[in-house]
């Protein structure tokens, strides 16, 4: 499955989305910065295969959207803008279930994508950790946005290197 | 791939005020900040301070906030930086660089610098 | 303003030889789990260069023999095995708070 270049431009539309629902600065949460242990191994250009990757996106997209979608994400940012978001995140979502399909069907893929998809779940378990212990302040989603921007940014450059390698 | 292009070598009187651009391209101009950096001749870096082109927002080093103002214009993807009541210790080279991995705040790409030698 | 210790402010070392640049902070630039703390490479009449961000991340692009380590308020950058091209100033910085402030720069000579 060739990952169509739809994707790699919403993905590049979710990135500036995230970046315009910035409400405070950075700056004054620097302090409240955090390593929520990014699981890179999981999108590891030597070790992944196609199909874990793909799987990998797919769960981490689906967690965003989950992340964002709660009451209190709701109340932390812009209504307008965050709905711009899920349409990203949905049209996304269906761009890589079209792709899993495809990809998946061997039953060894499939459970080595249960690592994947379990090491993204944990990913997103410590960052709703971290939220509920800050009690969703306006610094705690800021640093929550910057990582998830991160996280979206190399799995950007790293789809970039899978529709090379087809 | 990612380039800032800065203006060229400036020459100016104590007390005046120069502006220095910073060309960006082969990224989203709006979606990173800016940072800027001073260096005065065969010595190291100072951080002067940081703008984000998308909304404008600007965070400056207590130590030039009075002597720096950073602005940006999106629709010719250019970052700016204004020095005002310029002295002898303004005479330096100043960098444009883009900041890297959102909240790290490290440098990844450095405009060639612009040169400011003030000189009465 | 946390200030950046670095020494030795100049070394020669042979080429193949290894290299050791230490940055100190006055305070603390670690928080949980991250060392804001980076290090850039300058050559004479150049832009500096990001080599190793995070303490000990390797910037694409960079050679391997570069490395970087530490936490909490010391820091160090090792070049092994060092080759003609790492003829350069190298500052560390660090954002753990504002203002971000750079080290004074070690000036490495290849023997």
């Known amino acids: 499955c060739d990952l169509p270049q739809t994707h790699s431009l919403g993905n590049r539309r979710a990135l500036i989305l995230l970046a315009q629902m910035g409400r405070i600065s950075h700056f004054s949460c620097l302090k409240d910065r955090y390593d929520f242990g990014f699981p890179q191994e999981v999108f590891d250009g030597n070790q992944f295969q196609k199909a874990q990757a793909i799987s990998a996106f797919h769960e981490m997209i689906q967690q965003t959207f989950n992340l964002f979608s709660t009451k209190d994400s709701s109340a932390a940012w812009d209504e307008t803008l965050l709905d711009k978001f899920y349409i990203e995140l949905f049209q996304q979502l269906n761009d890589l279930e079209a792709c899993v399909t495809q990809e998946v069907g061997v039953e060894e893929i499939a459970l080595m994508n249960e690592d994947s998809i379990l090491a993204v779940r944990k990913y997103f378990q410590r960052i709703t950790l971290y939220l509920m212990g800050k009690k969703y302040s306006p610094c705690a989603w800021e640093v929550v946005r910057a990582e998830i921007m991160r996280s979206f940014s190399f799995s950007t450059n790293l789809q970039k290197g899978l529709r090379r390698k087809d | 791939q990612v380039q800032l292009q800065e203006s060229g070598t400036v020459l100016a009187r104590p007390g005046a005020s120069v502006k220095m651009s910073c060309k960006a391209s082969?990224?989203?101009?709006?979606?990173?900040?800016m940072h800027w950096v001073k260096q005065r001749p065969g010595q190291g870096l100072e951080w002067i301070g940081v703008?984000?082109?998308?909304?404008?927002?600007?965070t400056y080093n207590q130590k030039f906030k009075d002597k720096a103002k950073l602005t940006a214009v999106t629709s010719a993807n250019t970052a700016y930086m204004e020095l005002s009541s310029l002295t002898n210790e303004d005479s330096a080279v100043y960098f444009c660089t883009r900041n890297y991995k959102y909240d790290y705040y490290t440098m990844d790409y450095w405009g060639q610098g612009t040169t400011v030698t003030v000189s009465s | 303003d946390i200030v950046l210790t670095q020494s030795p402010a100049s070394l020669a070392v042979s080429l193949g030889q290894r290299a050791t640049i230490s940055c100190r902070a006055s305070k603390s630039v670690s928080t949980s789990g991250h060392s804001y703390m980076h290090w850039y490479q300058q050559k004479p009449g150049q832009t500096p260069k990001l080599l190793i961000y995070l303490a000990s991340n390797l910037e694409s692009g960079v050679p391997a023999r570069f490395s970087g380590s530490g936490s909490g308020t010391d820091f160090t950058l090792n070049i092994h095995p060092v080759e003609e091209e790492d003829a350069a100033t190298y500052y560390c910085?660090?954002?753990?708070?504002?203002?971000?402030?750079f080290g004074s720069g070690t000036k490495l000579e290849i023997k």
């Open positions: 910085q660090h954002s753990g708070e504002l203002p971000f402030t």
């Open positions: 703008i984000y082109p998308g909304n404008g927002d600007t």
């Open positions: 082969g990224y989203s101009f709006t979606t990173y900040w």
